[in-house]
Interface confidence: low
């Protein structure tokens, strides 16, 4: 239904707290360099204006679209061109082009310092002094570093953060209470960020149809008792919610997500028997819970998929009459039978089925042609299954850090032109798949591994798009989203690469490494490992292991030495010589 004032409508629906949080996220995601105080001032102005519209929907400017209101606010910021360069050119455009322009200037890798967590006492003091400002800072800092973070979900993480601080700041040992809990929230939020970015990439590159197909597969796996009409309705609504968030329409997105959660809770009988626990929770927790609810029990009496999609005499007729609906029912039926497959795999199978029908339905004897289609799925299914087995075996043997190193070597060989920081970040993230997925029950491993890897590789593609340097990466990133992971897995050593010169300074370390936290130490060592591979792309695993063991031993010895500086300056050059010899 149309509202006289869109901003008043959203303020009323969302309430002041969520309204302000979402506006802050929106501004922080668009203008990623502005300080919290600058954004907080804008948010207050927008909120005050919304309140005047709530009081009188006919008041001046209350009938303007949210894009117009928000865009005008952003364009009024002083020194926009000095701080943001060509983004300021967006302000010369009219809506909707102005918003599109803002979206195109979102930076997936902004040059901001890492978000450092203050020490416990300081955090608790500032939280107690002003919890609202404290949480505002959290929203601002996360949103500007992750310009596509799913806004209503970020409000959920802020709520989690708030609850943890409320609990832990009352404890004697604040540090040991806060650290593991906040680390847990951070890990989940980072995964949520790459997953959502993947959804926005799907939407931006391949349109709503591609996203809707993803949603149908995912929802059919989770709700196998829901009928196709129900799944289609949920997928359509979910597509709308994600389109809005990816497009910067955060108030609409959060409002529609709340509506979808309400609908699901009011229609449990036609959706799933597993929803009640989620539906008992307050809004943010409810929507989060529904998004990761366990799969419902599969109906016991599902007929074989072949009946309707291979053996039925009307296959080509049904396909020709309504291609999208027929393929949609195939995806639904296959997905509800296979909660053990990844969504990417299910979409590859649907694509294979579509290609088979396109080819066979044009032939003289279609049934003879498409009769073997299900058997042709076998290699497509075996490939990710083998990937999971091989990688989980390796993870179990090496542990997370060793597994990350193995992936780092593999990916540096595949794409040695990619910058070392990007390779290290990618390998560390890809390596976490072991901890995240390999410990799960067998039937949950494949969906966990492949869908997580796809999301991480999407980030690799986004970073590479900014400065394309590797033909290998460009080739894999320009294909369809669901083919990316198999494409990257199939890459081998890049034979076109001219090895890097050996530079001693790349492998020269100083005593300051000794005081770094363990994570930073690992990154330093992994940076050296990537550089070694760039110098010797065809080095064997044994050679690299020898060098890295020697390097670890060197660090251990010098960090324990009484005179660390002397140890590093005398032993360092010897290490460099030994490395060169080992790789000769």
């Amino acid at each position: 239904e149309a509202h006289k004032s869109e901003i008043a409508h959203r303020y009323n629906d969302l309430g002041e707290q969520h309204f302000k949080g979402l506006v802050l996220i929106a501004f922080s995601q668009y203008l990623q360099k502005c300080s919290y105080d600058e954004h907080a001032k804008l948010v207050q102005e927008v909120t005050d204006f919304a309140k005047t519209c709530v009081a009188d929907e006919s008041a001046a400017n209350c009938d303007k679209s949210l894009h117009t209101l928000f865009g005008d606010k952003l364009c009024a910021i002083p020194n926009l061109r000095e701080n943001y360069g060509e983004l300021a050119d967006c302000c010369t455009k009219q809506e909707p082009e102005r918003n599109e322009c803002f979206l195109q200037h979102k930076d997936d890798n902004p040059s901001l310092p890492p978000f450092e967590r203050p020490e416990a006492e300081a955090m608790c003091t500032s939280f107690k002094e002003n919890p609202t400002t404290f949480m505002g800072h959290y929203l601002h800092e996360v949103a500007r570093r992750h310009p596509y973070f799913y806004a209503p979900e970020l409000l959920y993480y802020a709520e989690q953060y708030n609850e943890i601080l409320t609990q832990c700041c009352a404890e004697a040992d604040k540090e040991s209470c806060l650290t593991p809990k906040l680390d847990g929230v951070k890990e989940k939020a980072l995964v949520s960020s790459v997953r959502q970015r993947m959804k926005c990439s799907s939407m931006q590159k391949f349109g709503e149809r591609a996203f809707k197909a993803w949603a149908v597969a995912r929802l059919s796996q989770t709700f196998p008792n829901a009928d196709f009409a129900e799944i289609t309705k949920l997928a359509t609504d979910l597509t709308k919610v994600n389109k809005e968030c990816c497009h910067g329409d955060l108030l609409e997105c959060a409002d529609d997500r709340a509506e979808l959660a309400k609908y699901m809770c009011e229609n449990q009988a036609t959706i799933s028997s597993k929803l009640q626990t989620c539906c008992d929770k307050p809004l943010l927790k409810k929507a989060h819970c529904l998004s990761e609810v366990e799969h419902d029990t599969m109906p016991a009496d599902l007929p074989a998929i072949a009946a309707d999609f291979v053996e039925d005499q009307e296959v080509c007729k049904n396909y020709a009459e309504a291609k999208d609906v027929f393929l949609g029912t195939f995806l639904y039926e296959y997905s509800r039978r296979h909660p053990d497959y990844s969504v990417s795999l299910l979409l590859r199978l649907a694509k294979k089925y579509e290609a088979t029908l396109e080819k066979c339905c044009a032939e003289a004897n279609p049934p003879a042609c498409y009769g073997t289609v299900l058997a042709e799925f076998q290699p497509l299914v075996e490939e990710p299954k083998n990937l999971v087995k091989t990688n989980c075996d390796l993870y179990e043997k090496l542990g997370e850090y060793g597994f990350q190193n193995a992936i780092l070597v593999r990916y540096t060989q595949k794409a040695p032109q990619v910058s070392t920081p990007t390779l290290v970040e990618a390998a560390r993230n890809l390596g976490r798949v072991g901890t995240k997925c390999c410990t799960l029950p067998e039937d949950q491993r494949l969906p966990c591994v492949e869908d997580y890897l796809s999301a991480i590789l999407n980030r690799v593609c986004l970073l590479h798009e900014k400065t394309p340097v590797s033909e290998h990466v460009t080739k894999c990133c320009s294909g369809s989203l669901v083919e990316r992971r198999p494409c990257f897995s199939a890459l081998t050593v890049d034979e076109t690469y001219v090895p890097k010169e050996f530079k001693a300074e790349t492998f020269t370390f100083h005593s300051d490494i000794c005081t770094l936290p363990e994570k930073e130490k690992q990154i330093k060592k992994q940076t050296a490992l990537a550089e070694l591979v760039k110098h010797k792309p065809k080095a064997t695993a044994e050679q690299l292991k020898t060098v890295m063991d020697d390097f670890a031993q060197f660090l251990d010895t010098c960090c324990k030495a009484a005179d660390k500086d002397t140890c590093f300056s005398t032993e360092g050059p010897n290490l460099v010589t030994r490395c060169k010899d080992a790789l000769a």
């Epitope: 008792n225 809770c265 449990q268 009988a269 036609t270 028997s273 539906c279 008992d280």
Partner: nanobody, 115 residues
Framework: EVQLVESGGGLVQSGGSLRLSCAAS????????MSWVRQAPGKGPEWVSA????????RYAESVKGRFTISRDNAKKTLYLQMNSLKPEDTAVYYC????????GSQGTQVTVSS
Amino acid sequence: EVQLVESGGGLVQSGGSLRLSCAASGFTFGSFGMSWVRQAPGKGPEWVSAIDGGGADTRYAESVKGRFTISRDNAKKTLYLQMNSLKPEDTAVYYCTIGQSTSRGSQGTQVTVSS
């Protein structure tokens, strides 16, 4: 198609009793928690009581605790509400709902308690 049909309402004197039934069809009844909700004239829906799928866990609104009892028979796909010591303020249309939702998907049954 999901269907919920309530019955058992009527006019009763203050202090009297009624037993409401709700016949369910079109879904796996035993897998879902169920609730009773009521709506008095001119007021919003008010949640009354809930029961889990197996029938072991029951919950009540403060206003009906000790007077009303919710139960279910999964074999018959039926939900019940035994209402004792009825008061005039219990006058409302009573609906059964799936889960613990206050949304009304059925016709309801009228309960009128006269003083």
